[in-house]
């Protein structure tokens, strides 16, 4: 199936041009999207392309600029948030950060009503997470690990919390590892529907080992960076939540919220909050075995001043086959009762659907089902639930809209958005207004991405918000690859993969191979989505077919393929990556002396072991980033697939699942080793040992550090390694430069 | 000191409204929930219900739903209990009690009482 | 609702003897956090005094020779010495669930 078909034709040929790696490391082709800044039903906010804030009405069609491009620029502004009340409005600037979600920053409140900038008892600075109260304009900020309350913007703040400490005690945000893999957030604080109360959680990393790595900076010594990062098996974070009522914080003060007794006999997440109503409220804990997952809805007594959970409101979610949840647990979407809600996990046949629940989850109803995923609830209204999944046309990487009526019986099901721009767009998401009134529908592909707006009673398209007419103009005289998504079926296992090929790609030829890989549990590379990037380049510039694979351990096509790595990662995704080379190569048109294999981060984990399967398959391969032994990674994530590195445990597969272990399999493959020194996620320690193991087993490799660079390897940093990738390539291709 | 006091007994014959008041003092009256309970003679306790002056929640106890409307004045830091319909089984005294703060469902300061007769 | 059973009905001791009086709930009035049971005494004429908060705790002004104990569905009231001012009636209130439930009470008279 071609998705992006070629738009060659001979009469044009002398005007097209290949992509060049100038082209993508400039980001000439890079598209925009628009989602609207919701504050009600039927208006949204906009930063214009000139820097103004600018409120649109959708039902009167009328625009005003509610804050100049001046203002913002007397501040250096660079993000903003208006009060629920719209009478003030902070802005951001010296945004500083920190991990994937965290970042300090400077806020000035700027008064609407006067148009200045309010004054006594300003901010304090760097503030590390600031929001407004969903109702009128209280403000709660996390400075120095504790948390802060003010009734109004100009008033004196209220201190909620007094033992934040620097890598110690966190308030209202997330340590580093709850930040990056359970919350996937930088805050750790949730207001109640009408501000009435705010939640927080208190994260205590005492007796948390740290990871200590040198930044270089430009000083006679160098820094040493210390985060609290529990690897496999090591000392967790003591989590506690905590509400305080907003209206009277000093009555009785925080109240902390117990947790379900079967949660609280062993080590235990908690995984999310949501708000259900002012005075109650839904939590969600997990074992740090993570297997079983506690969702208890709490309520406010007000004779107790305090939360109460019974028991008969605590809904347990087991997996038998694998771990709780996808990546993670899924959230619960309240109905209009505020005691029923929806929920997507796993059904009776392993394929995750959304269900409802209104006593208990034995008792749950069953609301979409199929050998497909729903994969996001976007929003429930009194008579419709908007939720996306993968079922159209039974392709796992695509992802459509679609309404449920849940006011009328039986339900009704309606695909919004499958037919709106069928050859375009096939890849989804959504952002609902106010009672979804209103909804823009965002579309990444396979075309050219595209934003528009509708109506949420009828699904009528009001007008298109973005539609990248400038990156359609810049593309029209150049020569992309095609793509292809298509399927292998081996042995009951669907394979399915997207192959980009050169744009005057002819199947009677033989051209190189370059697998790129992912491959992490719970992740999806084969989707339906546009992009111009580094193997675009490859495919059209330097004639390689690239190919991206989804083997097992990969999302959205039920728990077979999912829990196929539970307990033993490093085995089937890399055996799948390797079946599909071979399916590849019995194509015909791939010169099997030239096929190499390349990821990032559990890509270059995967990448790394395939070359080192003793295949034979590979001429080399680059590794970016890898983890090299589960060991050295977050508890939280790897526990998650791997349970713990003890004897009685899963030790064995952890010391066999080393890149270390095959280190003598790397002799006969050319092998591009790549990491940041200053990688707070994947430490450089693993690269380090790689590296170590291999110069031990007297085995030769290539490899590039980036001083002072984190996993995302950003700046300069990209442009060197993506032009150092394709040197390795192309020598190991034998292509000329 | 905190202080609850109440209105003086009644007496009431069956089908008619009593309402009972309950002065506090001694506290910030719009901080503690204000509970009602019951003794009919030679009786046990019988919780009626409660009401916040602060928030103006209030909870009634299922058996009296629709009989009873507790209300507060909190100008005059006043909170009355209302009981219509009477018949002869509501003849006990009442008593108002303050909620103590951080004691989560006790009563730690009651008023005096006041007897309601229902007699014909 | 929370049925409130207290035993004995009726306990006859002489001043300086310990008393100890039961009181048992038809379902568990504890959480994690606190159990809630109050005990009250209660003389006649008179309005109902809080002796002791949430199981165990001492109500400011109460002398401590009160002492209260019990999770779950089973607390006791315990006086250590009876004085002769202690003979009264005395009554367990649970806050767990609403409605808000008293125990039928014990009372305590001289021997």
């Known amino acids: 199936i071609v998705l992006r078909p070629s738009r060659v034709h001979n009469s044009e040929e002398n005007t097209m041009r290949a992509l060049t790696l100038k082209d993508i490391l400039n980001g000439t082709f890079s598209y925009k999207t628009f989602f609207p800044n919701w504050i009600s039903g039927q208006e949204y906010l906009h930063q214009s392309a000139d820097n103004n804030i600018v409120l649109y009405n959708i039902e009167t069609g009328q625009s005003y600029t509610i804050l100049s491009n001046r203002t913002m620029k007397s501040v250096n502004a660079s993000n903003y948030g208006l009060s629920p009340d719209r009478q003030f409005v902070y802005l951001e600037s010296d945004y500083s950060k920190l991990w994937r979600y965290s970042y300090t920053a400077t806020y000035y409140i700027y008064d609407l009503s006067n148009g200045e900038f309010v004054r006594g008892n300003e901010l304090p600075r760097p503030i590390q997470y600031l929001c407004w109260s969903p109702v009128g304009s209280k403000l709660a900020y996390v400075y120095q690990n504790n948390i802060y309350l003010k009734q109004r913007p100009g008033d004196p703040p209220f201190q909620i919390t007094f033992n934040g400490r620097e890598n110690k005690i966190f308030n209202g945000i997330p340590d580093w590892v709850y930040e990056e893999e359970m919350l996937a957030t930088k805050y750790a604080l949730w207001w109640s529907p009408n501000g009435k109360f705010l939640a927080y959680a208190e994260f205590n990393d005492t007796d948390i080992p740290v990871i200590a790595y040198s930044y270089y900076g430009d000083e006679q010594y160098p820094r040493t960076i210390n985060i609290p990062y529990p690897k496999a098996g090591a000392k967790n974070p003591v989590v506690r939540i905590f509400i305080i009522d907003t209206t009277y914080p000093a009555y009785v003060g925080p109240q902390e919220v117990p947790v379900p007794a079967m949660i609280a006999s062993s080590d235990y997440y908690f995984s999310w909050l949501t708000w259900v109503t002012d005075e109650r409220v839904c939590l969600q804990w997990l074992k740090r075995v993570q297997n079983v997952s506690v969702l208890s809805i709490c309520d406010f007594r007000e004779d107790w001043q305090t939360w109460d959970c019974p028991k008969t409101q605590e809904h347990i979610e087991e997996s038998r086959t694998g771990w709780a949840g996808g990546f993670f647990v899924s959230t619960p979407v309240f109905s209009y009762d505020a005691i029923s809600y929806y929920k997507i996990f796993s059904d009776k046949d392993g394929y995750k659907h959304i269900h409802y629940i209104k006593d208990t989850v034995e008792n749950a109803i069953q609301i979409t089902s199929g050998k497909w995923e729903a994969i996001n609830i976007f929003r429930v209204t009194q008579d419709s639930l908007f939720y996306s999944s993968n079922e159209f046309e039974e392709y796992p990487g695509r992802r459509n809209i679609y309404r449920i009526s849940i006011g009328s019986y039986p339900p009704s099901k309606k695909c919004v958005t499958c037919h709106l721009r069928k050859e375009r767009c096939q890849y989804y998401t959504a952002s609902f207004s106010d009672y979804a009134k209103y909804y823009a529908l965002v579309c990444y592909g396979p075309g050219i991405p595209i934003s528009t707006l509708h109506d949420g009673r009828t699904d009528q398209e009001i007008k298109i918000l973005e539609e990248n007419k400038e990156l359609e103009n810049a593309l029209k005289n150049i020569q992309l690859p095609k793509e292809e998504i298509k399927k292998l079926e081996v042995d009951e296992i669907t394979l399915w993969y997207k192959m980009i090929l050169p744009p005057q790609f002819d199947r009677s030829k033989k051209y190189p191979l370059l697998i790129q890989v992912y491959g992490g549990p719970c992740s999806q590379s084969v989707r339906s989505v546009f992009a111009v990037n580094w193997i675009s380049y490859l495919a059209s510039k330097e004639g390689m077919v690239i190919a991206l694979v989804d083997g097992r351990g990969t999302a959205f096509q039920g728990d077979k393929l999912l829990y196929a790595v539970y307990r033993k990662l490093g085995v089937y995704e890399v055996e799948d990556q390797i079946t599909a080379v071979r399916k590849f190569i019995e194509m015909g048109f791939i010169d099997e002396k030239r096929i190499a294999i390349w990821g990032w981060s559990y890509g270059g984990y995967v990448s790394s072991l395939a070359l080192a399967s003793g295949t034979g398959l590979f001429k080399c391969g680059i590794a970016v980033a890898p983890v090299s032994s589960w060991e050295y990674y977050a508890s939280v994530y790897t526990e998650r697939f791997m349970g713990l590195p003890t004897k009685d445990d899963n030790l064995e597969h952890y010391k066999n699942s080393t890149v270390m272990a095959r280190a003598e399999y790397f002799r006969n493959v050319d092998y591009l080793l790549i990491h940041g020194t200053a990688d707070d996620n994947v430490h450089f320690q693993n690269s380090a040992q790689i590296a170590k193991a291999l110069v031990n087993a007297q085995v030769d490799f290539q490899a590039m550090w980036y001083s002072d660079q984190n996993h995302g390897l950003s700046g300069l940093s990209t442009n060197h390694l993506y032009t150092h990738m394709t040197h390795f390539l192309k020598q190991c291709f034998s292509l000329s430069d | 000191q905190v202080q609850l006091v109440q209105s003086g007994a009644e007496v009431k014959k069956p089908g008619a409204s009593v309402k009972v008041s309950c002065k506090a003092s001694?506290?910030?009256?719009?901080?503690?929930?204000i509970h009602w309970v019951r003794q009919a003679p030679g009786q046990g306790l019988e919780w009626m219900g409660w009401?916040?002056?602060?928030?103006?929640?209030?909870k009634y106890a299922q058996k009296l739903q629709g009989r009873v409307t507790m209300t507060t004045d909190t100008s005059t830091s006043t909170a009355y209990m209302e009981l219509r319909s009477l018949r002869s089984d509501d003849t006990a005294v009442y008593y108002c009690?303050?909620?103590?703060?951080?004691?989560?469902?006790?009563?730690?300061?009651w008023g005096q009482g006041t007897l309601v007769t229902v007699s014909s | 609702e929370i049925v409130l059973t207290q035993s004995p009905g009726t306990l006859s001791l002489s001043p300086g003897e310990r008393a100890t009086l039961s009181c048992r709930a038809s379902?568990?009035?504890?959480?994690?956090?606190?159990?809630?049971m109050h005990w009250y005494q209660q003389k006649p004429g008179q309005a109902p005094r809080l002796l002791i908060y949430?199981?165990?705790n001492l109500e400011s002004g109460i002398p401590d020779r009160f002492s209260g104990s019990g999770s779950g569905t089973d607390f006791t009231l315990t006086i250590s010495r009876l004085e002769p001012e202690d003979f009264a009636v005395y009554y367990c209130?649970?806050?767990?669930?609403?409605?808000?439930?008293f125990g039928q009470g014990t009372k305590l008279e001289i021997k």
């Open positions: 009690a303050r909620h103590g703060g951080t004691a989560r469902g006790a009563m730690d300061y």
């Open positions: 001694g506290y910030t009256f719009t901080e503690n929930i």
């Open positions: 009401i916040h002056p602060g928030s103006g929640s209030i």
């Open positions: 379902q568990s009035v504890s959480t994690s956090a606190y159990s809630y």
């Open positions: 949430l199981a165990s």
């Open positions: 209130q649970q806050s767990r669930e609403l409605p808000y439930t």
